[in-house]
């Protein structure tokens, strides 16, 4: 999947638009809004009916380094009485980011841009019934 | 910067840490995974906090479609199908890396963005506290 | 694709055993739950046995001491030792499989118990 280039007619290329060799992009990692924060309600992984853990993933050869996936605890949703009841299910909720992977060939080193799967957390749902044949 | 194990054979020149500015190949690798989220799963209906999603588009920014959830209600809905607020819906929230078109409208100069998406909501129990 | 196979259904004399079994191929999850339910001519299906991620395991009263759920993770498949069989046993047992968001249930396998 590639990049879609500025296809509206009333962007114009700039002038100022760097040089950048054929089938690669350049581009600058300095992250914009690096140190924006989550204002999520607090602690919703433990309070949450449909509670999860979270695991963090360590590679040097990505950027960023480290990425958190969330594990729901369990089958089931936790009841008003605390206990797990599994006529209702827990289930992950993803949302793909982007990240860079650095691959060595050799002594040479490139660039890639990879789409990354993650877990955020769980909800509970009513499951789907399936009858197999 | 991130240190990276070095193949002790290479000339020492390389840098440990990722460079600032990156050249990339314009291929993203991995996965057709499915960028709609209403198409990949029905979750945000059959959930007891359940959300709506909002299409956000920006031609400026890669990808250019990004879907953000909003919780339908403030409790969670009972196994009545009626809703319940003695339980809140809340959003889960995620720090996401997009890229910015850098300088503006140049189709191929890109810089990351963080940027702060709801992903969609779970239903907790809410912090009680006693105002004095 | 899920398919369950059941087996282990047939017809047996009051007091006597029978083990059903049914294996789940397709889907594997890290968290998921097996049993069975069953269904008397007439009446609701209702829970017979579960076991929950190989573990925490869930009875009706009417069959506690003389029904045993066990599972086999590695084949994906659960057992049901079932002793001392009575004629209020007899129902078609329906195979449950439970991953995250999907529940999935067999054709059923007859149990049939003479006095």
């Known amino acids: 999947r590639k990049i879609p280039k500025v296809g509206h007619t009333f962007f114009q290329k700039p002038e100022s638009c760097p040089p950048v060799p054929g089938g690669s992009m350049k581009l600058d990692i300095g992250i914009i809004n690096e140190n924006q924060r989550v204002s999520m309600s607090r602690n919703i992984e433990s309070r949450s009916t449909s509670p999860w853990n979270y695991t963090v993933t360590w590679d040097p050869n990505r950027y960023p380094s480290e990425v958190v996936q969330a594990q729901c605890r369990n089958l089931g949703c936790i009841n008003a009485q605390g206990k797990e009841d599994i006529s209702m299910n827990s289930v992950p909720i993803q949302q793909e980011t982007l990240v860079v992977r650095r691959k060595h060939q050799g002594c040479s080193v490139s660039f890639q841009l990879e789409k990354v799967l993650v877990t955020v957390g769980c909800t509970c749902v009513t499951p789907v019934i399936h009858h197999v044949q | 910067g991130i240190t990276i194990p070095r193949n002790p054979g290479c000339p020492n020149s390389e840098d440990k840490n990722f460079p600032r500015t990156v050249m990339v190949n314009l291929n993203i690798h991995n996965r057709n995974t499915n960028t709609n989220p209403k198409r990949s799963s029905d979750y945000y209906n059959r959930s007891t906090s359940p959300w709506n999603l909002h299409r956000n588009e920006d031609p400026e920014r890669y990808p250019s479609v990004i879907w953000e959830a909003k919780c339908r209600h403030l409790g969670c809905i009972n196994a009545d199908g009626n809703v319940d607020y003695h339980m809140n819906s809340v959003p889960i929230q995620q720090e996401i890396l997009v890229l910015r078109r850098e300088p503006p409208h140049c189709p191929n100069s890109f810089r990351l963005e963080k940027i702060l998406v709801s992903v969609g909501c779970t239903c907790v129990t809410p912090i009680v506290h006693h105002v004095a | 694709e899920v398919q369950l196979v059941e087996s282990g259904g047939g017809l047996v004399q009051a007091g006597g055993s029978l083990r059903l079994s049914c294996a789940a191929s397709g889907v594997i999850f890290r968290l998921n739950a097996m049993g069975w339910y069953r269904a008397a001519p007439g009446k609701q299906r209702e829970l017979v046995a579960i076991?929950?991620?190989?573990?925490?395991?869930n009875y009706a009263d009417s069959v506690k001491g003389r029904f045993t759920i066990s599972r086999d993770s590695a084949k994906n498949a659960v057992y049901l030792q079932m002793n001392s069989l009575k004629p209020e046993d007899t129902a078609v047992y329906y195979c449950y499989y439970n991953i995250p968001g999907d529940v999935y249930w067999g054709q059923g396998t007859q149990v049939t118990v003479s006095s």
């Open positions: 076991i929950v991620n190989g573990g925490s395991t």
